[in-house]
């Protein structure tokens, strides 16, 4: 057949699996003058075998993993043996079977953790090999827990990274694992090839013992530290500590304060630094950060709260310079005059800032002193002694001594008398008759002007007039303004007109005075007014019922989930419809009659939180008016990302020959969210076949060394494979590549002779 | 047995041409290529090209061109050389030799024709 | 073309002793088979040429093993060990790796 199995001399390339007894020849090549025979030469192994006609077969089954890849030439050669075409690569690439089981490096692993680790943090690796093509089931290796001795209540407290071997604590196991309740665990782990996959998959097991040590890194309790402190700073309130030795410690102000007034040393010893005063705050949180030596965070802050303890460092003030109360004539004994009530900055409910009123001087004393007393505690002041007479004392000036247990302040009060409260405010109108306003009329337009007279003392409580509406607008769409000097009445408007709720409304005002009438004096019929006011209709739009809505979920939603709903009103009852605008992703739908909206394809958080479009509502019917609400979409981070090269690392190279072993730095990220502490990814090589020429370093949670395991490297590019794994919930691994090339210099540069195209790397190490 | 029996020696005028005959004999012709070579008296040997019979494929030395043709004839399994424009230049003994096609060796020559140019 | 030198044009020997010609080519003569590609043969006075070696070390039929042939892939080496009197004669080293096949200049083995 020719073409598949026949043809002339090119290079090609042939699948074979392994472990197969040979059952058909590879290919016929064809000669062509001179050309009379074929030669064969390259990794033969001695199976690969050409007749002189040109047939290519091989005498025996193939390993892979003896050699995965065997690369011939074939050339073709004239009656003296002489080369007149080729050679021609013909490279045999031997395809894998499941014919090695995996088997794990060690039978016994042993291991320790810290209570309260962070789930899915690694603190140990198992590790299996499995010598068949990790590109295929056949060499994708799966981990398991098998068992967890001991299994209390049923909740497993360690997990594995089926990919990679790594071994963590969950959330139960970083809450509930307690050295002091159990100190070691057991676990069996299990690896199969296949994937795990297959029912037909070899598998290993290994052992692996773990101690849990204990975790101090804890926050302490609450410290309380008395304010205005005279003794001498730094002072030392508290202290932390990090599980091993070398940690850098600082402290993190969460509220941004001008004035920080605490320290922490090197060794965790937590310090105020100047003395504190509760009247300015009372309180303070802050954080406490453990780092290593490259600045990564080794665990979640500690939060450190600051209790401030109040001393009697505030005197009691008094509300204004002179306190003003007025008096009848006539009024009773024992009557209310008014209260005065001081201040005292010191801690609320204690005796620092508990008051004692006491009057120590009254002018004049006419008729007589002691006409006035004050509750000691309350500030109010009452008539003692006799009913006053405005003609014999207008006004009496009080001194009082305000008094916490520390302090004492003089107030100073004065007390008008006055005439008696004994004429009652008229309307000059009872109905203000019929007012016909829009609904959208605006807020603040003053509408009606009313007014009442009083006939008591003026420019007193007496005389005064506060009006009310008492009747017919129960939304308190309405409000009166007094000008003082007239007693004049401006009804304006409060709130939104409504038509729809109110087409009609009957007012009715009250007059009244700030002053008690005299015993026997009573408002009737004159103090009160009404008035009708009539709304007329004007169209208006729906009206949402919030500015702005708000849901919250997470980015890794099923479609068609329901993520949120808005609402909206027609004030004239018409149906609404809702619609999106601005949904530039195209992520959101929403129902056009509930308002509920939901997802019609995969969120993203990396592509921007929170999401935000806008919802429209618009009326069904009349005149289809609309209006525009905001619908903010927050997504919650799921780890969707798996970690990648931060960079761009092309053009790395190394001086060939090597003088000795080097190393480069590399940087690894990933999309997801990292909060306090950052990312925390883990390295290792891509392949065992690279374990003899390089090893990778874990520097910190974000960088890594690659190094190189000795000089014997050719000149040329090695690609090198490194498998980053993120660690998170589930954890995400990334294989990477970084080129390497060893190539010859001049003055610390890669030599490339002139016309050499490729790309010429740029950074030596 | 093998054998290449070659002609007879030749006396030419300058100018002439002359065609050597190499008869095989004692192995498949077709399956083998014939190859001539030149040795002036006293002098060391240089290689003149080659004649496969089975395609009838030949190879000259280009300093050779023009100057020799290599042809065969299966039925009565002979090669043959022509030298044309002959000169005192060509007064030499021409061998021919068999290459053989597995391991490649020049294992059997022919006695050799010697060739003499003279006015 | 490939240029085939024979420093020596003669080398005299006592008949038993034993004796080494040598040969070199201006270009590799090792093809990536592993393969050699070098003749060496001997002009007895008045007779063709005979294959002694073939592919730089391989001893061609009928050739007595006193006959050895080594070299790398430009210098080449023919031994006669306890040379005899039939030996006499102009030896040559030819490369067939490429065309045109190209001969030594040869070396006269000559009897003190």
């Known amino acids: 057949q020719e073409g598949k199995f026949s043809g002339p001399l090119k290079p090609m390339t042939f699948s074979i699996y392994e472990g197969q007894e040979p059952s058909q020849i590879i290919f016929q090549f064809k000669a062509n003058p001179p050309a009379v025979t074929f030669e064969l030469t390259g990794e033969t192994d001695n199976i690969f075998v050409i007749e002189r006609e040109g047939l290519l077969y091989y005498n025996r089954a193939l390993d892979r993993e003896t050699r995965s890849t065997h690369n011939l030439q074939v050339a073709a050669l004239d009656a003296n043996g002489i080369i007149v075409e080729g050679p021609v690569p013909i490279t045999i690439k031997v395809k894998d079977i499941n014919d090695n089981r995996p088997t794990f490096l060690q039978s016994k692993y042993e291991g320790s953790v810290r209570q309260n680790s962070r789930p899915g943090k690694p603190f140990l690796y198992v590790n299996a090999t499995d010598l068949d093509d990790p590109a295929t089931p056949n060499g994708q290796l799966y981990y398991q827990i098998v068992i967890q001795l001991p299994m209390i209540n049923n909740v497993m407290y360690f997990q594995i990274n089926n990919k990679t071997g790594a071994i963590s604590l969950t959330r139960e196991g970083s809450q509930e694992l307690n050295p002091a309740k159990n100190p070691s665990y057991n676990l069996v782990i299990s690896v199969k090839d296949m994937g795990g996959q297959s029912e037909n998959s070899f598998s290993d097991t290994t052992s692996v013992d773990i101690i849990v040590t204990e975790n101090i890194w804890k926050a302490p309790k609450p410290v309380e530290m008395v304010e205005n402190s005279t003794d001498p700073h730094p002072i030392k309130i508290t202290q932390v500590r990090w599980n091993d030795p070398g940690a850098q410690y600082s402290l993190v102000d969460k509220e941004k304060l001008p004035r920080f007034p605490f320290s922490i040393d090197q060794e965790g010893d937590i310090y105020v630094t100047q003395p504190l005063d509760r009247e300015e705050k009372d309180a303070y949180v802050f954080y406490a950060v453990a780092k290593d030596e490259y600045g990564k965070p080794l665990s979640y802050p500690l939060e450190i709260h600051v209790k401030v303890k109040d001393i009697n460092d505030n005197p009691p003030t008094c509300p204004s310079p002179v306190t003003v109360f007025e008096v009848q004539e006539n009024e009773r004994l024992g009557n209310s005059i008014g209260t005065l009530t001081a201040h005292d900055r010191d801690e609320e409910n204690t005796a620092n800032s508990f008051l004692n009123y006491r009057i120590v001087e009254q002018t004049p004393k006419l008729p007589m002193d002691g006409l006035f007393l004050i509750q000691t505690y309350a500030g109010m002041l009452q008539l003692a002694k006799q009913s006053l007479k405005k003609q014999d004392t207008p006004q009496y000036n009080l001194t009082i001594e305000v008094s916490d247990k520390d302090f004492k302040t003089l107030c100073f009060v004065q007390i008008n008398v006055i005439d008696i409260n004994d004429q009652i405010p008229i309307f000059e109108k009872s109905d203000y008759g019929n007012l016909t306003l829009a609904e959208d009329t605006n807020i603040g337009s003053t509408i009606l002007t009313i007014q009442a007279t009083d006939a008591d003392e003026p420019f007193t409580g007496s005389s005064k007039i506060l009006y009310h509406i008492i009747k017919g607008d129960s939304e308190g769409r309405l409000g009166v303004d007094t000008d003082p000097h007239t007693n004049t009445g401006y009804v304006i408007i409060k709130k939104p007109l409504d038509f729809e709720t109110a087409a009609v409304s009957n007012i009715v005002f009250k007059a009244e005075n700030p002053e008690p009438l005299v015993f026997g004096v009573k408002y009737n019929a004159s103090s009160f007014a009404k008035f009708t006011l009539i709304v007329t209709d004007v169209n208006e739009a729906p009206q949402f019922s919030q500015h702005v809505f708000q849901a919250k979920v997470s980015e890794d939603v099923a479609i068609g989930t329901k993520v949120g709903n808005v609402t909206a009103k027609d004030p004239e009852g018409l149906d609404i419809s809702y619609s999106l605008r601005g949904d530039t992703r195209g992520w959101l739908k929403i129902d056009h009659v509930t308002g509920e909206i939901f997802s019609v394809a995969p969120l993203d958080r990396e592509a921007g939180s929170p999401y935000r479009v806008q919802v429209v509502a618009t009326e069904v019917g009349g005149s289809s008016l609309s209006s525009v609400s905001e619908f903010h979409l927050i997504l919650m981070d799921v780890n969707d990302n798996p970690p990648r090269l931060a960079k761009d690392y092309t053009g790395l190279f190394f001086c060939h020959p090597l003088s000795a072993p080097g190393s480069l730095i590399f940087e690894a990220t990933d999309d997801d969210q990292h909060l306090f502490r950052g990312p925390h990814f883990t390295f290792s090589l891509g392949s065992g076949s690279l374990q003899n020429d390089w090893e990778v370093s874990k520097i910190n949670g974000t960088h890594a060394r690659l190094s190189t395991r000795h000089t014997e490297f050719e000149e040329r590019e090695y690609v090198v494979l490194i498998r980053i794994n993120d660690g998170g919930r589930p954890p995400l691994e990334g294989i990477v590549s970084l080129p390497v090339t060893f190539c010859s210099c001049v003055e610390g540069s890669c030599f490339r002779p002139a016309g050499h195209q490729t790309g010429i790397p740029t950074v030596g190490m | 047995q093998v054998q290449l029996q070659q002609s007879e020696a030749e006396l030419v005028k300058p100018g002439a041409s002359v065609k050597l005959s190499c008869k095989a004999s004692?192995?498949?012709?077709?399956?083998?290529?014939i190859h001539w070579m030149k040795q002036r008296p006293e002098q060391g040997l240089e290689w003149i090209g080659y004649?496969?019979?089975?395609?009838?494929?030949?190879k000259v030395n280009e300093k050779f061109k023009g100057k020799a043709t290599l042809t065969a004839d299966t039925s009565s399994s002979t090669a043959y050389m022509q030298l044309n424009s002959l000169t005192s230049e060509d007064s030499a003994v021409y061998f021919c030799?068999?290459?053989?096609?597995?391991?490649?060796?020049?294992?059997?020559w022919g006695q050799g024709t010697s060739v003499t140019v003279s006015s | 073309d490939i240029v085939m030198t024979q420093a020596a044009p003669s080398v005299p020997v006592t008949p038993g002793e034993s004796v080494s010609i040598s040969c070199r080519s201006s270009?590799?003569?090792?093809?990536?088979?592993?393969?050699?590609?070098l003749y060496w043969f001997l002009q007895r006075p008045g007779q063709s040429p005979q294959l002694l070696i073939y592919?730089?070390?391989n001893l061609a039929s009928g050739v007595p093993d006193r006959f050895s042939g080594s070299g790398s892939g430009t210098a080449f080496t023919l031994r006669i060990s306890r040379v005899e009197a039939e030996d006499v004669g102009v030896y040559y080293c030819?490369?067939?790796?490429?065309?045109?096949?190209?001969f030594g200049g040869g070396t006269k083995l000559e009897i003190k």
């Open positions: 004649i496969y019979p089975r395609d009838d494929f030949a």
């Open positions: 592919r730089m070390s």
């Open positions: 030819m490369q067939h790796l490429e065309y045109p096949f190209t």
């Open positions: 030799a068999r290459m053989t096609n597995y391991l490649y060796i020049m294992d059997y």
């Open positions: 270009k590799s003569l090792l093809r990536s088979n592993g393969n050699t590609y």
């Open positions: 004692g192995y498949t012709f077709t399956d083998h290529a």
